[in-house]
């Protein structure tokens, strides 16, 4: 996965900090106040979508080969820049009974991006 | 994740068989001759992109929160119908020494789809 730099237009990971207060979740999430969630942005033209390291999975490589070798549109729409690696984050929050609970929420932080 | 049934155009899993001959991989993949790779197809309108079940993760829900409020840089970020669950498949192939080896290849088969 590639990190976005300057005028990069190809699929890359953009660093982004989300503030829970900003999205109105501070009333139930106690800690942390926010986190570097990051997101994926950029183009996935066919010639790069199947490249190792850029393809989201083996499955993606297979589909992109088919797209290149067959009439367009036989295997779904365009390729999309999406998370390929994520990691969890621990949250301290109020449950329905107003107890404070700590839980590891999966897939919170985007670590890498690729073409679907 | 939804199965595509021809009636809905919302993000769903479409059954699809890939023949390794069709993509020119029959020279190194010995078995099987192909497999049900499947793929994701359909729309991810903003009102469903963040709903759990159709959503990729907590992360998608956060992004959608920003997107629906028109926050830059998320306003132009389109939600994509992508695999949310993939599973491996065993393959027999020739290694560099022309030996036949069996391996579980990760992320070969799309099991479920969701909106990124």
């Amino acid at each position: 996965g590639i990190d976005c730099q300057g005028g990069s237009r190809m699929c890359c990971r953009q660093e982004f900090f989300v503030d829970f207060r900003e999205i109105g979740w501070h009333d139930w999430i106690i800690q942390p106040e926010g986190y570097a969630m990051n997101f994926c942005i950029g183009q996935c033209p066919l010639h790069i979508a199947g490249m190792p390291g850029i393809a989201a999975s083996f499955h993606t490589a297979v589909l992109n080969l088919l797209k290149a070798n067959t009439a367009a549109g036989t295997t779904g729409g365009g390729s999309c820049c999406v998370p390929t690696a994520r990691r969890p984050l621990s949250l301290l929050y109020y449950d329905r009974d107003s107890n404070i609970v700590k839980t590891d929420i999966p897939d919170m932080v985007v670590e890498a991006c690729g073409c679907s | 994740g939804l199965e595509c049934d021809g009636k809905v155009n919302i993000c769903c899993k479409k059954q699809f068989f890939v023949s390794f001959k069709d993509i020119g991989w029959n020279d190194w993949i010995i078995a099987p001759s192909g497999y049900h790779a499947n793929y994701c197809e359909g729309e991810c309108p903003s009102h469903i992109a963040g709903t759990s079940g159709s959503s990729l993760s907590f992360h998608s829900t956060v992004i959608n929160h920003y997107r629906m409020r028109g926050h830059s840089p998320f306003a132009n970020l389109k939600s994509c119908c992508v695999p949310t669950k993939l599973r491996p498949m065993s393959m027999l192939y020739y290694d560099d020494g022309q030996n036949i080896i069996k391996k579980d290849i990760q992320n070969m088969i799309v099991e479920e789809c969701g909106c990124s």
């Epitope: - | 001959k21 029959n26 020279d27 010995i30 078995a31 099987p32 001759s33 192909g34 065993s90 393959m91 027999l92 020739y94 030996n99 036949i100 080896i101 069996k102 579980d104």
Partner: antibody
């Protein structure tokens, strides 16, 4: 349903040749690998050869390499095992079996090859 | 070539017994091991693949376990039709090799 039927076995003298056939039904041989596995009287199973789905890739056990040739006729949905320079130790019941990624998920009933002078 | 060694070579048991057969590979084969059942005068029957996945049509009293080099086939409660010879086989690399077999007899 999937069915494999072997034929062509018999009694043959050492050094002579024999061609075994395996007729498949319920599936197409061009989509699967087909193996030959043999079993000497009162002994265990021994893998002999395979022709993979694309028809170009073939593999043999060291014990038969250079003497046995595996081939396929897609129009007849049949796989063949051409056995030359037969030896007493080739005496066995020969099974053809359908490949499931290196496993054998369907077997024929076998054809007996006896090499004897 | 990968050598497969089964133990015991033969085994006597009664209907209702729980029986375990072991198979050892001469090198790591991950979980790429299968089990077959063969009755006299019949072709082998595919029972278990990938060490623990049961082939459709095989009775649920058969189960497999193990990975790497050591594997087991377990029959939870022997039925009269289970008396046969059992073979393990590795599908990790060519040549595909079988164990020498375990003959399961009535006590």
């Amino acid at each position: 349903q999937v069915q494999l039927v072997e034929s062509g076995g018999g009694v043959v003298q050492p050094g002579r040749s024999l061609r075994l056939s395996c007729v498949a039904s319920g599936f197409t041989v061009s989509s699967y690998g087909i193996h030959w596995v043999r079993q000497a009287p009162g002994k265990g199973l021994e893998w002999v050869s395979v022709i993979w789905y694309d028809g170009r890739n073939k593999d043999y056990a060291d014990s038969v390499k250079g003497r046995f040739t595996i081939s396929r006729d897609n129009s007849k949905n049949t796989v063949y095992l051409e056995m030359k320079g037969l030896r007493a130790e080739d005496t066995a019941l020969y099974y053809c079996a359908r490949d499931k990624t290196g496993d054998f998920d369907s077997w024929g009933q076998g054809t007996l090859v006896t090499v004897s002078s | 070539d990968i050598q497969m060694t089964q133990s015991p070579s033969s085994l006597s048991a009664s209907v209702g017994d729980r029986v375990t057969i072991t198979c050892r590979a001469s090198q790591n084969i991950n979980s790429f091991l299968s089990w077959y059942q063969q009755k006299p005068g019949k072709a082998p029957k595919f029972l278990i693949y990938d060490a623990s996945s049961i082939q459709s049509g095989a009775p649920s009293r058969f189960s497999g376990s193990g990975s790497g080099t050591d594997f087991t086939l377990t029959i939870s409660s022997l039925q009269p039709e289970d008396f046969a010879t059992y073979y393990c086989q590795q599908s990790y690399s060519s040549p595909f090799t079988f164990g020498q077999g375990t003959k399961l007899e009535i006590k």
